[in-house]
Amino acid sequence: KSSNEATNITPKHNMKAFLDELKAENIKKFLYNFTQIPHLAGTEQNFQLAKQIQSQWKEFGLDSVELAHYDVLLSYPNKTHPNYISIINEDGNEIFNTSLFEPPPPGYENVSDIVPPFSAFSPQGMPEGDLVYVNYARTEDFFKLERDMKINCSGKIVIARYGKVFRGNKVKNAQLAGAKGVILYSDPADYFAPGVKSYPDGWNLPGGGVQRGNILNLNGAGDPLTPGYPANEYAYRRGIAEAVGLPSIPVHPIGYYDAQKLLEKMGGSAPPDSSWRGSLKVPYNVGPGFTGNFSTQKVKMHIHSTNEVTRIYNVIGTLRGAVEPDRYVILGGHRDSWVFGGIDPQSGAAVVHEIVRSFGTLKKEGWRPRRTILFASWDAEEFGLLGSTEWAEENSRLLQERGVAYINADSSIEGNYTLRVDCTPLMYSLVHNLTKELKSPDEGFEGKSLYESWTKKSPSPEFSGMPRISKLGSGNDFEVFFQRLGIASGRARYTKNWETNKFSGYPLYHSVYETYELVEKFYDPMFKYHLTVAQVRGGMVFELANSIVLPFDCRDYAVVLRKYADKIYSISMKHPQEMKTYSVSFDSLFSAVKNFTEIASKFSERLQDFDKSNPIVLRMMNDQLMFLERAFIDPLGLPDRPFYRHVIYAPSSHNKYAGESFPGIYDALFDIESKVDPSKAWGEVKRQIYVAAFTVQAAAETLSEVA
């Protein structure tokens, strides 16, 4: 049956009608409207934008649109006492200071309330000491420094280049290494693509451009003062000393002009290999400290930012379902930005706005979706996914019982090369089928499907003729829905060519230069990529909310579970002797995966044959599909990460942005050869195999015939 039969509506109200209503020109107009002033979380400007969106969503035709507010911990620079870094001579005189703000882009010289670059949630402090260059400050970089080069970071200020991993992991690694301060900088090797001009003449980062960002290690906790519970009017708040995830050492970001001045004087050890060299004209010496002539000079940080409990506002819009109003499909993306938010988040918010408008147009013509669609404009994502997490904490009981799917809608673009999708395996077939029906916006693929251009440009490493779909990690608002609550989730955006552009993210990420003009002039002048992303995100929401049978294929989960089991087994098999000594076996996991595969296959057969006109059976089958993702949740969570509860996927412990499969086993095996008590360490591996095997088996049983 076609999805339009669900609500007895005229055939014109189908997916095509919804997609045809989406217009590139509207997305462009909305992006312009959302990017003229900064919308920093916790500010009056962002509250006003929340009210504007509430009003417009009501006009578009949603049934209700409410503001949901929370009082959460945010972080701001001190307006009268700016943050900076200096080089001081032996007398303590400051002979060099880093800049206090980015030079404004043309046309924005008179805009007020541009927050200067800072590392959100950095503690205050004025540490001084010798500098150590730590490359990307990844786990492996500190291993190289400490184990191979015998360089001790204790009591040193470390300087790390942005890129490769989430900045919060860099700071955590530096803290664990004993550093007393962290300087983060953008190296042109990572943020300046060859052959492209710097802003305002291209999309590259100028020397004075700086990436803002939070440096928390929340591990899914949300507001640092109210982990697990909403930061509402009667909340009990932890003291700042007990807050979750706050860094303990001062941190500050700088651009490459200022980094040049710090790095050019570095002495000590030479870089261990070419992977430690960026593109600045400096030796990339590791240190510690400056070279001969400058050896008496030190680096001093001056950080005066403050943490403040501040009110934030989510906008929650509801389009009630006609048949299953107690089943929720959620489309959410954040509204708060570091400055203008030209890409992050407003290229996503503009797309959500147009999707809401299109759904509203259909609703005004008498249509309703089968299931309820919730639309969310999240606040304080940049400060640790706070708005989405607090709302999910407040509504967790409803969500765990009624949540069908969550589609994330942050930045629509990070390039203009091809589609990028990260999602639960349950959505693979939905994404494949949808993209086969959409036109590719890519040059050279006129008249071809999006699936075709995507597959050509980003082929799956495992399956020929299919596109790459990645694991969900974190660093965005789907985190609480997927990693904590076990609601099937996905995200889509247009991306760069990772083969030729090895820089991290996009060069102007979280800088003042992320403007409307950046998008309109350089990334997507026709807004055709934005429109395609709107079609993908909107199309997914439409199908999830309107198809009679949920568009989830449990067999795809079986395939990836086998792949992940093979991968983790091969990691463990790097230690064959220990596996033998400690009787480590993966038999239970492989057996559970085999059972899952067989049961999923049988379930899929039943799904083809059952009587879809019987509402009880239909609901029963759909519930089994809806609750499958939920079945991978371990109520006890992962070790030391209670809010990461998904047993199959979690954000990597070494990079929040990346997804790790069988994370419990992976972390237990990580660097196991260095553990002081191997018996205990391998015991934990065995326990994690047990948890994973049990969870996979238990999930399989939810797909069995109910009686």
Epitope: N97, F101, E102, P103, P106, K197, P200, D201, G208
Partner: antibody, heavy 119, light 107 residues
Framework: EVKLVESEGGLVQPGSSMKLSCTAS????????MAWVRQVPERGLEWVAN????????YYLDSLKSRFIISRDNAKNILYLQMSSLKSEDTATYYC????????????WGQGTSVTVSS | DIQMTQTTSSLSASLGDRVTISCRAS??????LNWYQQKPDGTVKLLIY???SLHSGVPSRFSGSGSGTDYSLTISNLEQEDIATYFC?????????FGGGTKLEIK
């Protein structure tokens, strides 16, 4: 060697027009911003205008925006300044200069050309 | 517009002296401060860019420092060829503006 050579200036009547040019050599012209800066005799320097790499963006001193036009011909390695409705206060030495990008310093300057606006 | 002020319009010093020329901006220019030398014949050269970076070919006796609104150019060991007028210029925002200049003379 970077070289910037301005065209001859000269004496012009108030209200008339004049076009200055600057011929560049010794570097890839299209890789640089270019600018005009002027200096009234015995006075300081005053930035007039600059232009980006391909001429798609131009920036002017507000008070000159309606009368002066900066342009470039990357094929010929020439920078231009079209001045119209000239006034006596436009009398100055006009320098052509090279810049790196929008915020960068002007790292090489021409020798300057003298323009006198007088009846 | 950002006003650039060089309070000392002329300065006399002896050869070998350490000379410091200062420049103040009417608002924070985030270190986008450049120094130029204009010789008596009108020739203009860039000395220092982004507060403290030495332009290629400029002798190391020239150095720059500062941040926020206050900047300075130092000549550590004055030579005859340094006799010129020195201008500061902000590159932080449009319009680009210059200081009034400091004329350096030999005592």
């Amino acid at each position: 060697e970077v070289k910037l050579v301005e065209s001859e200036g000269g004496l012009v009547q108030p209200g008339s027009s004049m076009k200055l040019s600057c011929t560049a050599s010794g570097f890839t012209f299209s890789d640089y911003y270019m600018a005009w800066v002027r200096q009234v005799p015995e006075r300081g320097l005053e930035w007039v205008a600059n232009i980006n790499y391909d001429g798609s963006s131009t920036y002017y001193l507000d008070s000159l925006k309606s009368r002066f036009i900066i342009s470039r011909d990357n094929a010929k390695n020439i920078l231009y300044l079209q001045m119209s409705s000239l006034k006596s206060e436009d009398t100055a030495t006009y320098y052509c200069a090279r810049g790196g990008d929008y915020w960068d310093a002007m790292d090489y300057w021409g020798q300057g050309t003298s323009v006198t606006v007088s009846s | 517009d950002i006003q650039m002020t060089q309070t000392t319009s002329s300065l006399s010093a002896s050869l070998g002296d350490r000379v410091t020329i200062s420049c103040r901006a009417s608002q924070d220019i985030s270190k986008y401060l450049n120094w130029y030398q204009q010789k008596p014949d009108g020739t203009v050269k860039l000395l220092i860019y982004y507060t403290s970076s030495l332009h290629s070919g400029v002798p190391s006796r020239f150095s720059g420092s500062g941040s926020g609104t206050d900047y300075s150019l130092t000549i550590s060991n004055l030579e005859q060829e340094d006799i010129a007028t020195y201008f500061c210029q902000q590159g932080n925002r449009l319009p680009r503006t210059f200081g009034g200049g400091t004329k350096l003379e030999i005592k």
